[in-house]
Amino acid sequence: LTCLGGFASPGPVPPSTALRELIEELVNITQNQKAPLCNGSMVWSINLTAGMYCAALESLINVSGCSAIEKTQRMLSGFCPHKVSAGQFSSLHVRDTKIEVAQFVKDLLLHLKKLFREGQFN
């Protein structure tokens, strides 16, 4: 078991459960989106490979005042082994492209769904 408690259920939860809950939160965001997500804020695009969770958090943590992604930020922090703060880019190896938060969430969601369906939970 991976210790990912705090955003859905108390105590440790299996990695599959944590990943599924993150996916469901991202689905909720994309399906409930009315106005431009986070007022069209731009974030750094990331490589969806090793260290993806920390990189995603480092990118999204720089968006402030957007309640729609606060839960996602908290969930991602459960997957990232180190503390992440705004302006930190240790996992963001490539910083050459900025995309809208909405597109970032869609890309991340598509990748996480594939990982889940393949059974890659860690």
Partner: antibody, heavy 123, light 107 residues
Framework: QVTLKESGPGILQPSQTLSLTCSFS??????????VGWIRQPSGKGLEWLAH???????RYNPALKSRLTISKDTSSSQVFLMIASVDTADTATYYC???????????????WGQGTSVTVSS | DIQMTQTTSSLSASLGDRVTITCRAS??????LNWYQQKPDGTVKLLIY???RLHSGVPSRFSGSGSGTDYSLTISNLDQEDIATYFC?????????FGGGTRLEIK
């Protein structure tokens, strides 16, 4: 309107390979979040999930049968195939194909089913 | 594997009755529970997904509830066309597993 239809050999002998085809319409397996699965039901018994394949070609199998199963798809002809190697009389059942999931969430709900095709393994 | 148990294999009720069919999982399945109806001719239809969400085209007399390991399907006003076998299925973890089914008959 979503429809699925299974076809198979009807009868085959032990040790042969069972080839099943699921032909579907009303949706495309190039559409994100959709999959097609195979389920079987021996006469008078319960349902058993065998395998499924997703739009992006991710394949999952029932571990109890994995060594004997092969699932594949032909997106352009809207067909999904299942092969079961080295069949035995225990493989005698009605075989169903079903579409999996369209909600965007991963609930593994099989929202539309075919009518089923009867397969008998007998020497 | 997660075992799904439908303790009642057959059930007899009168038209207009409220009928409840139960399903128990061998571990917490976190509401990933789907219900299917299989008619005597073998036709299978999804009724309820994710514990309580009604599939499109399914009459509102069908409802689902439950949490953790215990789930139920309720038919509020039994109709002749509800004569069928009902199966639960967990979608929490692979392999996907089904209950043994509950056959519903008219008294």
């Amino acid at each position: 309107q979503v429809t699925l239809k299974e076809s198979g050999p009807g009868i085959l002998q032990p040790s042969q390979t069972l080839s099943l085809t699921c032909s579907f319409s009303g949706f495309s397996l190039s559409t994100s979040d959709l999959g097609v699965g195979w389920i079987r039901q021996p006469s008078g018994k319960g349902l058993e999930w065998l395998a499924h394949i997703w739009w992006d070609d991710v394949k999952r199998y029932n571990p109890a049968l994995k060594s004997r199963l092969t699932i594949s798809k032909d997106t352009s002809s809207s067909q999904v195939f299942l092969m079961i190697a080295s069949v035995d009389t225990a493989d005698t059942a009605t075989y169903y194909c079903a579409r999996i999931g369209s909600s965007g969430y991963i609930y593994y709900e099989m929202d539309y089913w075919g009518q089923g095709t009867s397969v008998t393994v007998s020497s | 594997d997660i075992q799904m148990t439908q303790t009642t294999s057959s059930l007899s009720a009168s038209l207009g009755d409220r009928v409840t069919i139960t399903c128990r999982a061998s571990q917490d399945i976190r509401n990933y529970l789907n219900w299917y109806q299989q008619k005597p001719d073998g036709t299978v239809k999804l009724l309820i997904y994710y514990t309580s969400r009604l599939h499109s085209g399914v009459p509102s007399r069908f409802s689902g509830s439950g949490s953790g390991t215990d789930y139920s399907l309720t038919i509020s006003n039994l109709d002749q066309e509800d004569i069928a076998t009902y199966f639960c299925q967990q979608g929490n973890t692979l392999p996907l597993t089904f209950g043994g089914g509950t056959r519903l008959e008219i008294k």
